[in-house]
Amino acid sequence: EPTMYGEILSPNYPQAYPSEVEKSWDIEVPEGYGIHLYFTHLDIELSENCAYDSVQIISGDTEEGRLCGQRSSNNPHSPIVEEFQVPYNKLQVIFKSDFSNEERFTGFAAYYVATDINECTDFVDVPCSHFCNNFIGGYFCSCPPEYFLHDDMKNCGVNCSGDVFTALIGEIASPNYPKPYPENSRCEYQIRLEKGFQVVVTLRREDFDVEAADSAGNCLDSLVFVAGDRQFGPYCGHGFPGPLNIETKSNALDIIFQTDLTGQKKGWKLRYHGDPMPCPKEDTPNSVWEPAKAKYVFRDVVQITCLDGFEVVEGRVGATSFYSTCQSNGKWSNSKLKCQPVDCGIPESIENGKVEDPESTLFGSVIRYTCEEPYYYMENGGGGEYHCAGNGSWVNEVLGPELPKCVPVCGVPREPFEEKQRIIGGSDADIKNFPWQVFFDNPWAGGALINEYWVLTAAHVVEGNREPTMYVGSTSVQTSRLAKSKMLTPEHVFIHPGWKLLEVPEGRTNFDNDIALVRLKDPVKMGPTVSPICLPGTSSDYNLMDGDLGLISGWGRTEKRDRAVRLKAARLPVAPLRKCKEVKVEKPTADAEAYVFTPNMICAGGEKGMDSCKGDSGGAFAVQDPNDKTKFYAAGLVSWGPQCGTYGLYTRVKNYVDWIMKTMQENSTPRED
């Protein structure tokens, strides 16, 4: 607790002090006072530099004195033998004695009193910027007229801050302008305009005179403009050194004028006004601005329209134009939006065809669709070339945005059939000679693939089994081979409405309209061993003449086998219907006259004993297309016969083309359309 005065005595005083003592006293007087410490008695063993015994006076880190020996007063009117005056309010006194004393020393008596200090004069650093006033225990600062004392109670400045300018035009000057500005001041002026307007400051060189910079180039007095994160200045010197027109790009500007204690000049004067915030005329590629202007300012609205083939992509929606507004911050709204080339995207894949991965899917890019040749061809024309159009679609010159359709090539076997002799009297064949050949395992029979979804066969093959199991693509019908071939699953069987369904089909004598269609659940993939046969055209070119040759194939009875395991085939000529009528039916189920012969039947065979037989039913009688010799069409279907190895009767497919087309159309799937 600070005190105003006190007494300090060495141990045992006035008796002799003991050896080996170290004692300290911490003196503290109230703030604002100094300490006057004086000794009235001093009797301490003398030694060089008071090394043995001593009394030490310390102020902060400074040793004010170190005493030893004997002292007496020089002034008969004063008992003081030694004294110290410090301008601080704290002091430490330390007494030390060593291990022996040659004589008897009585030590010291000292007193301290709090004394006033003159803060205004006693220190090197003047505490007040202007006027300093001392009083007992302290001081205070004061200021000249029109100055005020800052919160630190030491510095004076002029009251030049706090002004906020909101008018769109105005003038600001330093205090007292054009008289000298006040020293030691910080003047802050704020300009706050409506958003969307930028502050533009204009100065004349002659309206600026501020204390010049020091030798290091640092302004002693300075004028600074701060607009957001941008700063202009500091400026100082005779004549304004900066740009005479400052576009701040901001609606808020802080003007800071800082002065020191020396060197006052006349100061400065400026004008400001608010400009609508300009927005840059940006170069937005592939677009047109409407309206077109040399300069755009706050609140201007433009419509930016993309050129053909370009679009604005926002989220998932594409648009051809957008509006942009010059905003209060000098930036265009929707500035992230750009006119990008229209992207037609990865082209859709097509069944049984392909499109090469395009290098680009952007506007103007070109892609080409191709079908899996030679098994498929492009049905709907157009050449397969598409370009990325301005509307974002892949477009073909002929088809527009419609995709090409790859449909199976019909009637073209991968390998031509060559007769090698053994069907009845026929030859071994490979499925590649007859890729349309379908195998039915129950009953053991045949059929002809006519497109991806449809199999043509004889009605008598499917009348007893409306869910036949069929196979394609295998020369051999040995079970292990069939497992590796393609099994076809029927969706529905369509028997010709003219086929008479009998209670006892075994007694049939009428095979008229012996034709049926099997709709498949899934499309068949074409290839070298699986590919359809063509249907006959409706023109007279497809009317068969006697002697025209056709090919039959199947796994039916041969001379040596009840059922062939490997495909057999034969080339037979068309014969007059009477030739079939003349052959005696081997096992008549009725009178020979009861057997029906109609124009819906083709008679063929009779040459070298070549004929179809049991197990070949439903297979195609394939004839070379008169208009395209590379192709075969199904002129007939193996139907019935009077006797194997003679003549056989085949359903005349040409008479059923309308029914076939109608049935297929009415029972197609969207996938196929």
């Epitope: 395992d441 009953p443 051999s476 040995q478 079970t479 075994e506």
Partner: antibody, heavy 119, light 111 residues
């Protein structure tokens, strides 16, 4: 379901004839071939022959050429085997069998008919 | 006629072991790359039952422990592991050439 139902056991005098039947269900015999197989008591199997019911085309093992006659009636879906001039050597179980969806084997057999030749 | 010889009339095999039954034809039963050899199992009082067709194809519904191999004139039926219910007589049969013929049969007993 494919089934072959054979006629019942026969006890016949030596020198007489007998006609065995095999009635099919679940398929048309016209679409298949009917085979006949003989098995003497405690003996192995012997192939008698086959018939194509569609045209009565037949094939016999030489041994049975004069002993057996195969016929088929597609209207009743039945095949028959007639054995003539019976002797004790003809005492056996006679089976009918078909191909089904096979091409040279018998996945389907009748239950067999026992023919006993005894004076 | 093609004669089929099953050299073993009688075969006794321990439960769980392998049974091998062979069949030799007097001439090849191959045609067009296929072997016309089939195997049947017969139990007393029952018709024969198809096990293997075309030398190596397992008839549907027959356990996989039955397998067939061979071509030309030499064929084998393997059963592994043998089970109690496999006690029966086994016949080979060729259908390559008329008349179709059967082997004499091999009777399998389970020890």
């Amino acid at each position: 379901e494919v089934q072959l139902q054979q006629s019942g056991a026969e006890l016949v005098r030596p020198g007489a004839s007998v006609k065995l039947s095999c009635t099919a269900s679940g398929f048309n015999i016209k679409d298949d071939y009917i085979h006949w197989v003989k098995q003497r008591p405690e003996q192995g199997l012997e192939w008698i022959g086959r018939i194509d019911p569609a045209d009565d085309h037949t094939k016999y093992a030489p041994k049975f050429q004069d002993k057996a006659t195969m016929t088929a009636d597609t209207s009743s879906n039945t095949a028959c085997l007639q054995l003539n001039s019976l002797t004790s050597e003809d005492t056996a179980v006679y089976y009918c069998a078909i191909y089904g969806s096979g091409w040279a084997w018998f996945p389907y057999w009748g239950q067999g008919t026992l023919v006993s030749v005894s004076a | 006629d093609i004669v089929l010889t099953q050299s073993t009339d009688y075969l006794a095999v321990s439960l769980g072991q392998r049974a091998t039954i062979s069949c030799k034809a007097s001439q090849s039963v191959d045609y067009d790359g296929d072997s016309y050899m089939n195997w049947y199992q017969q139990k007393p009082g029952q018709p024969p039952k198809l096990l293997i067709y075309a030398a190596s194809n397992l008839e549907s519904g027959i356990p996989a422990r039955f397998s067939g191999s061979g071509s030309g004139t030499d064929f084998t039926l393997n059963i592994h592991p043998v089970e109690e219910e496999d006690a029966a007589t086994y016949y080979c049969q060729q259908s390559n050439e008329d008349p179709w013929t059967f082997g004499g049969g091999t009777k399998l007993e389970i020890k």
